[in-house]
């Protein structure tokens, strides 16, 4: 059956031979209606990439550099399956490119000019492409030929395989730049030895190199890693201090109609039958015909790449930046230490309009990027298409797991002028019901629920976390008879109450009328039995404070809070009747942009913050007629975080633990991708 056939692309006679053997052996173990292998031979990996894009083949395994080529238009391929190394219990699908230095030296990443450098080899990922790609815009002009620019940047180097005649400085630390192990400073161990011997000041290697060469922790403690934010960390903190995370070897397919489920079914079956130590007659991860045919010999198996993970996310911002710099050879005109405009991520067209107005008022210091969901915005910030946005705590958690950092907190209670330097404790997550109902926390089963959105703090993580510990399962759509929880599966009962309009029904953005705090409260007013919101929601939308037709006649006394002890209290008593304390919303950004974002936002709020009194004829950053666009409308200021500058420290141990527990019930494709 052609649609059940995976056409594997082979790039040599030896690979084609192994592919045919793979095909024949898979035929013998798979049912006739299962996936099958067909072999397509091409002259090179680039030809394979083009063949897959043109639907003449379906899959090929590529190194990271080629995954980048495969992702570029017009190829538009995506990673679907990753090889892993090490054990099944602790599978490694990535390695980290790092810059290692001796602890007793005193320079940072931005002070490498004039130092002596040790590289694994010319054109190699960790030893050359990544460090030189990231340093590219700091190299002296002209930057071509690249070797000459690098020779003029460092005061001396060992770059195995470089041309010692044309670029003698690149071979200063290893005369001749030998391209094999005859050169004592060749490859990973060699580059590290170059540093260890004192020949060089910095070695560009992979994270495992130090551990492979220094078994003794005391010896390893004599070295540190240089981080991109111009700090240093110990060698075992490579996950938080690296130049780039590099995927090892990856199967790619078309982004649309790419047969990724079929490819996974095939490879999963293949590793069961012909993986490490599985079969004598055919081995997936070795071959009598040559080394690394179709797959790496060192691979131990395959892992399915999460569907939300596109090539940009898979390769990572740093890796793509490095490779793009090298390939395109373009650098910004502005010096790299100058803050470029900050690209704010706006959700759907409502936020985009407010962002546009901000952009005009900021004279272009703010630019705008749009996405349809918060998770899409976070992904855009990760890959550099956007720089920052303000997020509810639940999404601060996801953003943190995806490598972003909190930059400033929204403050709601502290009056100026102390606001900017005050760390507030947070707001209360509450359950609101109509005063006329007889509901309590203990009899919510079968009732109609209203949520701000799936994954948000007050609307989801806190109430559903509490509910989970009571019911011990994730079928929340069965607990409530129906509800509106934007971001739920469209056919779920938790989308039934949503108002839309269609096609935006149940979408987690302002196009869905019941989205957010105000939306969830509106859902309660019009259709629901209980709304999970922040403690300020009822006062902010009653007594004529919200002029919209549905809200203008509402009275605060017609609503009450549910307390966890089964009692109810007035909406004026959230301190004594709440579900939990929630961390304030916070602005997040990539680490490399955090300082810029903070500086610019503090400047912007001085001009457009809560000191502006007339928002009808002036732009106000924290105002959008109860719609909480870009920021919560009740924000007084954006406040510095001081030492709460990681998502764990910002959210607090208790909240992180609660959300981590709820991950069993996670419907977040982004979180799945970021924890791959």
């Amino acid at each position: 059956v052609p649609e059940k056939s995976v056409r594997w692309c082979a790039v040599s006679e030896h690979e084609a031979t192994k592919c045919q053997s793979f095909r024949d052996h898979m035929k013998s173990v798979l049912p006739s209606n299962g996936p099958s292998v067909a072999c397509v031979k091409k002259a090179s990996h680039l030809d394979c990439i083009r063949a897959i894009a043109a639907n003449e083949a379906d899959a090929v395994t590529l190194d990271a550099g080629l995954v980048y080529d495969a992702y570029l238009a017009p190829n538009n391929l995506k990673p679907v399956v990753a090889e892993f190394y090490g054990s099944k219990e602790d599978p490694q699908t990535f390695y980290y490119a790092v810059a290692v230095v001796k602890k007793d030296s005193d320079f940072q990443m931005n002070q490498l000019r004039g130092r002596k450098s040790c590289h694994t080899g010319l054109g190699r990922s960790a030893g050359w492409n990544i460090p030189i790609g990231l340093l590219y815009c700091d190299l002296p002009e002209p930057r071509k030929p690249l070797e000459k620019a690098v020779a003029n940047f460092f005061s001396g180097s060992c770059v195995p395989c470089a041309d010692g005649t044309d670029f003698p400085q690149l071979c200063q630390l290893c005369p001749g730049c030998g391209c094999s192990t005859l050169n004592q400073y060749f490859s990973y161990s060699g580059a590290f030895k170059c540093l260890k011997d004192g020949a060089g000041d910095v070695a560009f290697v992979k994270h495992s190199t130090i551990f492979e060469n220094l078994a003794n922790k005391a010896d390893r403690d004599q070295y540190e890693l240089l981080c991109l934010d111009n700090t240093r960390k110990s060698v075992d903190e490579y996950k938080d201090c690296h130049l780039a995370r590099v995927p090892s070897h990856t199967v790619v397919a078309r982004s649309v109609g790419g047969k990724e489920d079929l490819i996974w079914e095939l490879l999963n079956q293949a590793q069961e039958h012909f993986g490490k130590d599985k079969s004598k007659e055919f081995q997936l991860f070795s071959s009598p015909h040559g080394k690394d045919l179709l797959f790496k010999d060192s691979a131990h198996g395959f892992l399915k790449v999460p569907p939300r993970m596109d090539a940009k996310m898979y390769l990572g911002y740093e890796y793509i930046t490095a490779i793009r710099n090298l390939r395109e050879g373009t650098c910004p005109e502005a010096p790299t230490d100058e803050c470029k405009p900050v690209k704010w991520c706006a959700l759907s067209h409502h936020e985009r309009l407010k962002c546009d107005e901000w952009s005009v008022n900021s004279a272009g210091k703010i630019e705008c990027e749009s996405a349809e969901t918060t998770e899409d915005c976070i992904a855009k910030i990760m890959n550099g298409e956007a720089d920052a946005m303000s997020l509810d705590g639940g999404f601060v958690y996801i953003a943190g797991m995806c490598g972003l950092v909190p930059v400033l907190a929204e403050n709601y209670n502290t009056p100026n002028p102390n606001c900017e330097n005050t760390a507030e404790e947070g707001y209360f997550a509450v359950a609101v019901v109509k005063s006329s109902s007889d509901l309590t926390w203990d009899n919510l089963k079968g009732k109609k629920s209203c949520h701000t959105a799936v994954g948000r703090t007050a609307g989801w993580n806190i109430p559903m976390g509490l509910l989970y510990s009571k019911i011990n399962h994730c079928r929340f759509d069965e607990f409530f008879s129906e509800g509106c929880a934007p971001g739920s599966e469209k056919n779920s009962s938790l989308c039934k109450l949503c108002m839309g309009p269609s096609p935006n029904l149940c979408e987690p953005n302002n196009k869905e009328g019941y989205y957010g705090y105000t939306g969830a409260f509106r859902c309660l007013v019009e259709k629901g039995d209980v709304a999970f919101v922040k403690h300020q929601t009822v006062p902010q939308n009653t007594g004529g404070k919200n002029p919209d037709a549905w809200a203008k006649n509402l009275k605060e006394e017609d609503y009450e809070l549910l307390c966890l002890d089964g009692s109810r209290k007035s909406v004026q008593e959230p301190a004594n009747c709440h579900l939990a304390r929630a961390p304030n919303h916070a602005v997040v950004a990539r680490k490399d942009k955090a300082d810029c974002v903070q500086t610019l936002l503090l400047d912007q709020q001085r001009m457009f913050g809560s000191s502006v009194t007339d928002c009808s004829s002036n732009f106000c950053l924290f105002e959008s007629k109860t719609k909480d666009l870009l920021f919560r409308d009740d924000t007084v200021c954006l406040a510095k975080l001081h030492d709460r500058n990681t998502y764990e420290k910002y959210l607090g141990e208790e909240y992180v633990k609660a959300v981590t527990n709820l991950r069993k019930c996670s419907t977040s494709p982004l979180l799945e991708a970021c924890t791959f």
Partner: nanobody, 117 residues
């Protein structure tokens, strides 16, 4: 509520110029930001240029150096002077004053600009 009406569109050759006007009924003196947007067939509506009451302006990268936004508060009008027009500038152009605070429908009829030889 302020009512806005766009005019001045038309057919123009590549390299040519046009000036769009947006007249407000009601006083635009109380309005802070005015902006021109455009929407090409099958594309999202995008910000072209904006101007604040104090005269701060901002332009989309694709029109910088070719388009100029200005406003005349006495005439309750905002203008978009478009020079060196390109085929990719073809779109319906709308003006807005943001007074509806972003979430009600704020678009008038717009004015069609077609750049073609």
């Amino acid at each position: 509520q302020v009512k806005l009406e766009e005019s001045g569109g038309g057919l123009v050759q590549p390299g040519g110029s046009l000036t769009l006007s947006c007249a407000a009924s009601g006083s635009i003196f109380s309005i802070n930001t005015m902006a021109w947007y455009r929407q090409a067939p099958g594309k999202q509506r995008e910000l072209v240029a904006g101007i604040t009451r104090s005269g701060t302006t901002n332009y989309a990268g694709s029109v910088k150096g070719r388009f100029t936004i200005s406003r005349d508060n006495a005439k309750n009008t905002v203008y978009l002077q478009m020079n060196s027009l390109k085929p990719e500038d073809t779109a319906v152009y709308y003006c807005t004053d943001y007074s509806r605070k972003y979430y009600e429908d704020q678009w008038g009829q717009g004015t069609q600009v077609t750049v073609s030889s």
